[in-house]
């Protein structure tokens, strides 16, 4: 808090310009009019104010707009945005994508701060859903943004927005998130032909059910091992050896290197050793010949 002192003679600011960087904090407080600052906010970012000086300017805006800044001011905050607290940001009503972009630009290349998280939350809630343009913008600045949302929040993503998602945007998503995103992706890409469809859906397959994997196995997709290893274990277990062979195509040889890891390990335990031997990969751990496999889960479902 800067104490109130009279502005020294000849120092009253007529405009926001670079001469102000040489003002002491108390001089800024005394000599810069808050209304002038608000109308010339677009100049602030071009001037190398120290963060201490920006604190003074923020204080002046807070006094002028105790209920929250108007969007005309917010759009031009620039580095002053870094001095805002989440509490400040919760008072704002940000509706323009241009405003959002301008503020995200300030923090570009750095991890998402609490300020940015609050800003995005306010913006998305104001829009009612995560539309394609917003998602495009957010994932451009924060590739991991989508995976930071809860499954409940992801449910508000319309299928049309899925077109904006790049494979790297899903790198940190867990199975619960992919469970929500996969059906949306399936809907979004439903009109594409086989090979194009697979290219688009591949990143989302960690949420795919068994029946969809079986269908894919009939389409010569040649799924790579990295994608296979991210599939849901419960979706992989019911697949036959023949289906996995068709699904992976030439990549089936990679199963040997992954035989101790999930879901491959658990899948091997469910297959007949005879069937596994047909792959010629030396996979071990299948059900020995002559053993009867009882599917107890099926028994329970029938009773």
């Amino acid at each position: 808090e800067v104490e109130k002192t009279a502005c020294p003679s000849g120092k009253k600011a007529r405009e926001i310009d670079e001469s102000l960087i040489f003002y002491k904090k108390w001089e800024l407080e005394a000599c810069v009019d808050a209304a002038l600052l608000a109308t010339q906010m677009d100049r602030v970012n071009a001037i190398p104010f120290t963060y201490e000086q920006l604190d003074v300017l923020k204080h002046k805006l807070d006094e002028l707009y105790p209920q929250g800044y108007p969007e005309s001011v917010i759009q031009h905050l620039g580095y002053l945005f870094l001095k805002m607290s989440p509490e400040d940001i919760r008072k704002w009503n940000v509706t323009s994508l241009e405003t959002l972009k301008a503020l995200l630009e300030v923090n570009k290349g750095h991890e998402m701060s609490p300020q940015v998280a609050t800003l995005i939350d306010r913006f998305v809630k104001g829009r009612g859903q995560l539309d394609k343009d917003t998602l495009d913008t957010l994932t451009a600045f924060y590739p991991g943004y989508l995976c930071s949302l809860s499954p409940e929040e992801l449910s508000s993503v319309p299928p049309s927005s899925i077109w904006a998602v790049r494979p790297q945007d899903l790198d940190t998503c867990d199975p619960r998130q992919l469970d929500v995103l996969y059906p949306k992706a399936r809907l979004a890409f439903q009109n594409m032909n086989g090979s194009e469809y697979f290219v688009k859906i591949q990143s989302f397959l960690g949420g795919a059910p068994t029946e969809d994997l079986k269908a894919l196995s009939q389409q010569n997709v040649s799924m790579d091992l990295a994608t296979f290893m991210k599939l849901r274990t419960d979706a992989v277990l019911p697949l036959t050896v023949a289906e996995v062979q068709k699904l992976l195509g030439p990549h089936v040889e990679g199963l040997k290197a992954e035989e101790r890891h999930r879901p491959v390990r658990d899948w091997i335990l469910r297959q007949r050793q005879d069937d596994l031997d047909t792959l010629g990969l030396g996979l071990q751990g299948g059900i020995p010949n002559g053993y009867l496999v009882l599917d107890l889960s099926m028994q329970e479902a029938l009773s």
Epitope: P48, T50, Y51, Y79, L82, G109, H110, E111, S113
Partner: nanobody, 116 residues
Framework: QVQLVESGGGVVQPGGSLRLSCAAS????????MRWYRQAPGKERELVAV??????YYADAVKGRFTISRDNSKNTLYLQMNSLRAEDTAVYYC???????????WGQGTLVTVSS
């Protein structure tokens, strides 16, 4: 974190020249602006010069005599001081602030004495 280390201070006669250097290390990619401040004995610390992008700014007392520059390839800030006067005697501090953390970093200072 950004670390700043100044060098180049010393004793010089009035009218002489000195070049101060400030070597930056650490998260230098996030530096937003760099500045030289000075503090004369018994006085407040004052801003001398700023470099911000490709723009430079100078306090009236040093305009035309001092030049601030930055070599990004060496992560070094410079202050070329010409036509030095007795009133330029002070400890000169290098300062940088960063994007993201919105923090200020300071060097330990280097003493410049202008005396005949």
């Amino acid at each position: 974190q950004v670390q700043l280390v100044e060098s180049g201070g010393g004793v010089v006669q009035p009218g002489g020249s000195l070049r101060l250097s400030c070597a930056a290390s650490g998260s230098t990619f996030s530096i937003r602006a760099m500045r030289w401040y000075r503090q004369a004995p018994g006085k407040e610390r004052e801003l001398v010069a700023v470099i911000y992008g490709s723009s430079t700014y100078y306090a009236d007392a040093v305009k035309g005599r001092f030049t601030i520059s930055r070599d990004n390839s060496k992560n070094t800030l410079y202050l070329q001081m010409n036509s030095l006067r007795a009133e330029d005697t002070a400890v000169y501090y290098c300062n940088a602030d960063t994007i993201g953390t919105a923090r200020d970093y300071w060097g330990q200072g280097t003493l410049v004495t202008v005396s005949s």
